[in-house]
């Protein structure tokens, strides 16, 4: 049977003696990942002390002894007697210190120290010679061991191949003993025949003890590069993978640790483990309960899965996501949680594993550790959550996670804040429960504060602004959120983000947020006072010019600038101005910026969404008589009449409303003709509905919250922010849907149809529009 001493070779092998365990993992020759030993975290001490900074004398203790030790008084005679004894025994004290083995047994030598725990000066001076002597003895022993092993190895190799399993067992035990000594260990690893025999014996034996000894021997060899190479060349990897099926814990532990060392330090080992079916075996072992064993197993999985799609799919097929999530839910051992979170991080950039992790409850399980004192664990959980978050918008039971993420926005760690903002951005997309939850736990204030603190760090401001954009539309607390941004002094910084040095993705998000904030009448004046309107117009002009320039150069393809199409900016700015134009003072500013010619020009855009927002803003501006006249003077009647026939209901309705407002001062017969035109074009399918409005009494007054059509199949934009420590250049899902109606089936909110006052039944008669009429601003996009 295995002795306790044998078992103590394994840090994991259930031993109570923790010091022994630690010393094993900290052997200098042991090539481990540092998972358990932390061996790579400090420089080795040259003095042999644990920490060169620490003196090995406890000063307080010395002072205490100083005071205590001499409280006793001596007579002159006693002092003289003691002096005499010391003088007579000086040579013996030196000999005792230098060559203790030469002393006669039982001989008493008076010590010059009161406290036996402290060495005498002579003993201290003797330390170097003692060390030298030990070094010489060790060298002799090493040479003896090496010589003995060299002679023994050929015979032991034969015995390992013996027909008699009893002999094989004895040989295995002996080889294992030899492998514990450094010299003989080197001799073993330098014998390919011996290593092959060990490997063969290990996988062929039915004897538990033989399996344990051979696996233990390979484990001892794996602490050296030469040993790793010998194991690899001898076909040790398939044999060790086979041993992962052993019912004996010690064999299992030896096998997994040896494989771990191979994976870390031996070229070609990863491929060999994959080919031997190691991934399936390792995933099957995740139901074990020894935390140190699990830590090594999960680290092996991480090494194998990193940068290898096939491995990720094998882990998925073997039930890995569920098992890994269970570990995150069940255990508290930091190293295990950290290694498991690393595997999940690698898997979280795989489109097949992502939904499996989410469905296994991965979001909630990872969320449990976001307040852990271990920063490396928190960071891994956050990276993984961010990667998963775009696939988790339909998850239930996210309250705890959302609350923690809002708290983490207040962290001093920039990486933590970046991730928390990104996750909140995705989780608040198209999920009204999550939106309400975040609002209820102070998310608006936290996000505004985050944007204020972030300055021009766009990796924080962009996701934070996106999250605010989602929180300010399409849920019961949206109006509260729109007010809260203002009440927490967010409007100045939001408007500031429209200006340089902001890049297009951030500008796009900010424009969408401003559009949503403008839905709240209380924000109209502050946004105007902060100069939002001139900047939106400036951005609109610039983006429009850019699209025009490309068109004139014969380009039909929409081009991206920093990942944003300029058409999206045109659409966004126009849409924001449309909502801001609900306020009479804002309309004056908008008109004063000479925007009407541009809005009329946008009616000719080939993109329906741009047609719709352009018609929408003109509809608002046309409430004012001078503006209506200016619109007509710009020649808007022709394009508006054309748009009456648009298959996009929003476009047609806005066009009708502008034409109707432009006709306010026209003669009655003109109005009649217009009425017929509007009737025939707007109510092709339900002519009765128009008649019910009676004489076109369209009282287009103040705008309510626009009607919206919703679909429920969100598609997300994933974006790079390099260096997240992910698998290769895995995409980092941060953003929501793209703008515009360019992704059919996505959840795009409708930016709104005009509130036709008492003619609301006209609107009710409209069939639902297609996804192309939906705008991005409110982007839950």
């Amino acid at each position: 049977m295995a002795t306790q001493a044998d078992l103590m070779e394994l840090d994991m092998a259930m031993e109570p003696d923790r010091k022994a365990a630690v010393s094993h993992w900290q052997q200098q020759s042991y090539l481990d990942s540092g998972i358990h030993s932390g061996a790579t975290t400090t420089a080795p001490s040259l003095s042999g002390k644990g920490n060169p900074e620490e003196e090995d004398v406890d000063t307080s203790q010395v002072l205490y002894e100083w005071e205590q030790g001499f409280s006793q008084s001596f007579t002159q005679e006693q002092v003289a007697d003691i002096d005499g004894q010391y003088a007579m025994t000086r040579a013996q004290r030196v000999r005792a210190a230098m060559f203790p083995e030469t002393l006669d047994e039982g001989m008493q030598i008076p010590s010059t120290q009161f406290d036996a725990a402290h060495p005498t000066n002579v003993q201290r001076l003797a330390e170097p010679s003692q060390m030298l002597k030990h070094a010489v003895v060790n060298l002799i022993n090493y040479q003896d061991d090496a010589e003995l092993a060299t002679r023994a190895i050929p015979e032991l190799t034969k015995l390992l191949n013996d027909e008699d399993q009893v002999v094989v067992n004895k040989a295995a035990v002996m080889v294992h003993q030899l492998s514990k000594k450094e010299a003989s260990r080197h001799a073993i690893m330098r014998s390919p025949q011996m290593v092959s025999a060990i490997v063969r014996t290990m996988q062929n034996t039915n004897d538990v003890e033989t399996a344990r000894c051979t696996a233990g021997t390979l484990h001892n060899l794996s602490h050296h590069r030469e040993g790793l190479l010998a194991i690899f060349k001898s076909g040790g990897i398939p044999a060790l993978v086979k041993m992962l099926g052993s019912p004996v814990d010690s064999v299992l532990f030896y096998a997994i640790t040896t494989l771990h060392n191979l994976l870390l330090h031996q070229e070609g080992a990863k491929m060999a483990v994959r080919l031997a079916g190691g991934l399936q075996k390792m995933v099957a072992l995740l139901n074990k309960t020894n935390v140190k064993f699990l830590a090594i197993t999960t680290d092996c999985l991480q090494i194998l899965a990193y940068g290898n799609q096939e491995s990720k799919l094998i882990i998925l097929a073997s039930g890995g996501p569920q098992a890994l999530v269970n570990i995150m839910r069940t255990y508290t051992y930091e190293k295990l949680l950290w290694t498991t979170s690393r595997v999940l991080k690698v898997l979280s950039v795989c489109s097949s594993n992502k939904p499996a992790i989410v469905e296994a409850g991965g979001m909630q399980a990872l969320g449990l550790h976001l307040t852990d004192p271990s920063q490396r664990l928190v960071q891994n959980c956050l990276w993984t959550l961010r990667n998963l978050s775009d696939a988790a918008t339909k998850q239930e039971g996210m309250e705890g996670l959302l609350g923690t993420l809002v708290q983490l926005l207040g962290s001093d760690d920039i990486n933590v804040v970046t991730c928390a903002a990104g996750i909140l951005s995705n989780l608040t997309c198209n999920n009204y429960k999550n939106k309400m939850m975040v609002c209820q736990v102070g998310g608006i204030e936290a996000l505004v504060r985050t944007v204020l603190r972030a300055g021009d760090r766009e990796d924080i401001t962009e996701p934070a602004i996106c999250a605010l954009r989602h929180l300010t539309s399409r849920h019961q607390e949206a109006e509260m959120a729109q007010n809260a941004v203002r009440l927490h002094y967010g409007l100045p910084v939001v408007v500031k983000l429209l200006h340089p040095p902001s890049h297009w993705p951030l500008i796009k998000a900010t424009v969408g947020l401003i559009r949503n904030l403008a839905l709240c009448p209380a924000n109209h004046a502050p946004l105007r006072e902060q100069g939002a309107i001139p900047r939106l117009v400036q951005l609109l002009v610039r983006a429009h010019q850019d699209t025009q320039r490309r068109t004139s150069m014969g380009g039909t393809q929409q081009q991206f600038v920093e990942g944003v199409r300029m058409e999206e900016i045109v659409e966004g700015c126009t849409g924001a101005l449309h909502i801001l134009a609900r306020d009479v003072h804002n309309r004056i500013v908008i008109r004063g910026l000479n925007t009407i010619p541009l809005f009329v020009q946008l009616l000719y855009s080939p993109i329906e969404n741009i047609q719709r927002v352009a018609a929408g803003v003109l509809c608002e501006l046309a409430q004012d008589k001078e503006a209506a006249e200016a619109i007509e003077a710009e020649g808007a009647t022709a394009p508006l009449t054309e748009l009456l026939h648009s298959r996009n209901e929003g476009v047609a309705t806005y066009a009708a409303a502008v034409l109707f407002r432009m006709s306010e001062d026209k003669p009655q017969d003109y109005k009649k003709r217009l009425s017929v035109e509007l009737t025939s074009s707007l109510f092709r399918t339900e002519p009765m509905a128009w008649n019910e409005t009676a004489d076109l009494g369209l009282d287009i007054g103040a705008q309510g919250e626009p009607l919206g059509y919703r679909q429920d199949d969100p598609s997300y934009r994933s974006f790079h922010s390099g260096g997240y420590g992910q698998d290769a250049l895995g995409m980092d899902p941060m953003m929501e849907h793209e703008m515009g109606g360019h992704h059919p089936g996505a959840d795009y909110p409708v930016d709104g149809l005009p509130d036709l006052g008492h003619a609301q039944d006209l609107m009710d008669g409209l069939p639902p529009g297609d996804s192309n009429q939906l705008a991005w601003f409110d982007t839950d996009l």
């Epitope: 003995l148 002679r151 023994a152 190895i153 050929p154 015979e155 032991l156 034969k158 015995l159 013996d162 008699d164 009893v166 002999v167 004895k170 040989a171 035990v173 002996m174």
Partner: nanobody, 118 residues
Framework: QVQLVQSGGGLVQPGGSLRLSCAAS????????MGWYRQGPGKQREFVAS???????NYAASVKGRFTISRDNAKNTVNLQMNSLRPEDTDVYYC????????????WGQGTQVTVSS
Amino acid sequence: QVQLVQSGGGLVQPGGSLRLSCAASGSISSNNVMGWYRQGPGKQREFVASITDSDLANYAASVKGRFTISRDNAKNTVNLQMNSLRPEDTDVYYCRLTMMTAPPTISWGQGTQVTVSS
């Protein structure tokens, strides 16, 4: 130097019994295995049975249930009691002592003919 002296063997009818003995002399280490092997003309030497210093016995599948191995550590002897003998058990039987010294050593007896025939 270790010496192994075998005794027993001979001719026996199928179904009969025989007892082989082997005595070891010389400098024998305590950590050892004593066993029996057999070899026919032109054939490879084949393991039959063995026993450790702690009396752990091991048998080849072909003889299990028919042969019994035993040893006397004080006298450094090993015995093989062979029952229900079959014609295919006909071979030269060799005693072997494997000492787990450093390096290990293997010593062989001189061999004993066993013939099972009617």
